[in-house]
């Protein structure tokens, strides 16, 4: 077949006339949209057949595919057919009209489809949008065919701009018919069971009418078959469940349980597996370390957490100094044990606005009929230090003494410092640290007492200054793990009135 002009794509002017010629060794015919438009057929003296299609007064609606084929019933092969695509840019035609069935696109599986919105001008920029969205979708466009890609079940429209007006196509509706994609889910009532307890597994598939369930499980290999039960769930159609129930489990029933589901229509299948552990008896075991000494800060809230594994579910008790704790009505203590996975638990003791009296020996005990575990720790209440007293005195010996007294938990450290230049200190000059130096200028004496009832340390430190010849700023700083406190006093020479 010979087509003149050869194409494969032509751009023709609106209102013009154009002639297409096709010739071949047998009778030929032009086809447009599966029909034969009026055309002139002839046979030349040399035996060549031809057909002339004259397109007059062209409009945008003449845009599209034109085929030349052999016009006989010999069923010639498809390559004996020439395709030509003609564009007739026409500003009065936006998108080419579609048949109603072209607006509804049905799919039975995930596959590439074409949304057939076509324009008359190959130079126009065309974009694809969800019907209710402005954002253009990143899908490739072919001016001869439309947008091709994988689409979700949505409504789509095409947009283009002709001159200064925006033109929308009809809406295209994509429907995905869920025939037979199989998606299996498997779960167990418990994945850990004790010897003698039941194993119950469920395999669920949705949306398929004809399915076959096949289970593989440790007991099956040893020839002991269990008959599964198929349950048609009633909350929605084709929600089918297979239940495998093994009464009185044995240790050998531990292992992998697999549910394989096949669908006979398209021979699709899917399988999922789950591991089951049969234990001789129950267990409780601690996970992670909890230090034997724990800290809480006075008047702050503190949560103490213990993580453990157990089966079957255990009873959890907390004790303080061997007395059972419970949630207090005043809301000072809160106890909670959470099941964070099938066999993992988190038990928490929360002390709200911690008081000194809450220091002591704490124990968490988790137990059931088969096993128990306990964890103990000492809770220390940390109290920020505070300087309670800083005083200066002039004993008869001629030396001058400064006494600093403070409290805190854990035991506070005491730091003495002095500053001789009152104008520049401490902003410009760092204070000088004082203590038991080799020089005889100052001497330090510190005593520490632990007060059992208040559960804190008291520090009393006396600084002896030998020669004070000008005013001196003396600072006492107490420091511990949870804070520091400072006071200062001005020490003046004996000779100067204060």
């Amino acid at each position: 077949l010979v087509v003149t002009p050869p194409g494969p794509e032509l751009v023709l002017n609106v209102s013009s006339t154009f002639v297409l010629t096709c010739s071949g060794s047998a009778p030929v015919v032009w086809e447009r949209m599966s029909q034969e438009p009026p055309q002139e057929m002839a046979k030349a003296q040399d035996g060549t057949f031809s057909s002339v299609l004259t397109l007059t007064n062209l409009t945008g609606l003449d845009t599209g595919e034109y085929f030349c084929t052999h016009n006989d019933s010999r069923g010639l092969e498809t390559d004996e057919r020439k395709r030509l695509y003609i564009f007739v840019p026409d500003p009065t035609v936006g998108f080419l009209p579609n048949d109603a069935e072209e607006l509804f696109i049905f799919l039975t599986e995930i596959t590439e489809i074409t949304i057939p919105c076509r324009v008359t001008d190959p130079q126009l920029v065309v974009t694809l949008h969800e019907k209710k969205g402005d954002v253009a979708l990143p899908v490739p466009y072919d001016h001869q065919r439309g947008f091709s890609g994988i689409f979700e079940d949505r409504s789509y429209i095409c947009k283009t701009t002709i001159g200064d007006r925006e033109v929308d196509s009809d809406a295209y509706y994509v429907y995905r018919l869920q025939v037979s994609s199989i998606n299996v889910s498997v779960n167990a009532v418990q994945t850990v069971v004790r010897q003698g307890e039941n194993i119950t597994l469920m395999c669920i598939v949705i949306g398929n009418e004809v399915v076959n369930f096949e289970w593989t499980y440790p007991r099956k290999e040893s020839g002991r078959l269990v008959e599964p039960v198929t349950d048609f769930l009633l909350d929605m159609p084709y929600h089918i469940r297979s239940i495998l129930h093994i009464p009185s489990a044995e240790l050998e029933d531990s292992g992998t349980y697999t549910c394989n589901v096949t669908e006979s229509v398209n021979d699709h299948q899917d399988e999922k597996a789950i591991n089951i552990t049969v234990v001789e008896s129950g267990y409780v075991r601690l996970l992670g370390e909890v230090g034997t000494l724990q800290f809480a800060e006075l008047h702050r809230s503190r949560t103490l957490q213990v993580v453990f594994e157990a089966y079957p579910p255990p009873t959890v008790l907390w004790f303080k100094d061997n007395r059972t704790l419970g949630d207090s009505s005043a809301g000072e203590i809160a106890l909670s044990t959470r099941n964070v996975s099938e066999t993992r638990y988190v038990s928490e003791l929360t002390l709200v606005r911690v008081k000194v009296a809450e220091a002591g020996h704490y124990t968490m005990r988790a137990f059931h009929e088969d096993a128990e575990v306990q964890l103990s720790f000492q809770l220390q209440i940390n109290v920020p230090v505070r300087v309670l007293e800083l005083s200066e005195s002039h004993p008869d010996s001629g030396e001058q003494t400064v006494r600093c007294r403070g409290r805190g938990m854990p035991q506070p450290n005491i730091i003495w410092s002095a500053c001789r230049d009152l104008k520049r200190c401490p902003r410009e000059l760092p204070p000088t640290l004082l203590g038991n130096s080799s020089e005889e200028e100052s001497q330090l004496e510190t005593n520490v007492t632990y007060w059992e009832e208040e559960q804190e340390f008291e520090v009393v430190s006396t600084l002896r200054l030998q020669h004070v010849d000008r005013p001196l700023s003396v600072r006492c700083t107490l420091r511990n793990a949870v804070g520091q406190d400072t006071q200062e006093v001005i020490v003046v020479p004996h000779s100067l009135p204060f």
Epitope: V229, D231, F232, L233, L234, M236, P237, Y238, I243
Partner: antibody, heavy 119, light 106 residues
Framework: EVQLVESGGGLVQPGGSLRLSCAAS????????MAWVRQAPGKGLEWVAS????????YYRDSVKGRFTISRDNAKNSLYLQMNSLRAEDTAVYYC????????????WGQGTMVTVSS | DIQMTQSPSSLSASVGDRVTITCQAS??????IAWYQQKPGKAPRLLIR???TLESGVPSRFSGSGSGRDYTFTISSLQPEDIATYYC????????FGGGTKVEIK
């Protein structure tokens, strides 16, 4: 031939209890989900409760949850509806119906039993 | 919960007339709708399932159509034995019946 025969209906005072039964024959009972559907005098049909073929799952309309219990005995080919805390608005003909496996629409119905709740 | 609105609630037609009943769901029910016929004092009888599939033994004058939320039940040529109340029911998510349509002969 599939047959469903309901029994157990009658007159009961508000707050009282009643147990309906449905005897099934002509099909393998344990392969089918079953349901109770009711119809108040002069009114339309109303689904009440369903139970899966194994008896492992039950479903109820909101207005009867906590008051009605659907159960079955596959060995006896029987379906039951235990109705407690009955109210005047529970007065109806109660039909036993069979679910078709998988699709779940009701394919066969019994002739119904009348429950009247009145003081 | 899915609601089913059935209309009309009653209609009167002559023998041979075409009768149409509609049911609208409050959300898409994916063609999971069935139609039942109930005669006075009798149990309901299944006529159509999955929108348009006729049960065996049901005369071909009964038909169903629709998709998404909107469904139609049609009797192409009303016969005297068709006097009954007709119900739709959705089974996409549990079960909800329409209010029923009583069909009478003029």
């Amino acid at each position: 031939e599939v047959q469903l025969v309901e029994s157990g209906g009658g007159l009961v005072q508000p707050g009282g209890s009643l147990r309906l039964s449905c005897a099934a024959s002509g099909f393998t009972f344990s392969n089918y989900g079953m349901a109770w559907v009711r119809q108040a005098p002069g009114k339309g049909l109303e689904w009440v409760a369903s139970i899966t073929n194994s008896g492992g799952n039950t479903y109820y309309r909101d207005s009867v949850k906590g008051r009605f219990t659907i159960s079955r005995d596959n060995a006896k080919n029987s379906l039951y509806l235990q109705m407690n805390s009955l109210r005047a608005e529970d007065t109806a003909v109660y039909y036993c119906a069979r679910h078709t496996p998988g699709a779940n629409y009701f394919d066969y119905w019994g002739q119904g039993t009348m429950v009247t709740v009145s003081s | 919960d899915i609601q089913m609105t059935q209309s009309p609630s009653s209609l009167s037609a002559s023998v041979g007339d075409r009768v149409t009943i509609t049911c609208q769901a409050s959300q898409s029910i994916k063609n999971y709708i069935a139609w039942y016929q109930q005669k006075p004092g009798k149990a309901p009888r299944l006529l159509i399932r999955y929108t348009s599939t006729l049960e065996s033994g049901v005369p071909s004058r009964f038909s169903g159509s629709g998709s998404g939320r909107d469904y139609t039940f049609t009797i192409s040529s009303l016969q005297p034995e068709d006097i009954a109340t007709y119900y739709c029911v959705q089974y996409a998510n549990l079960y909800t019946f329409g209010g029923g349509t009583k069909v009478e002969i003029k």
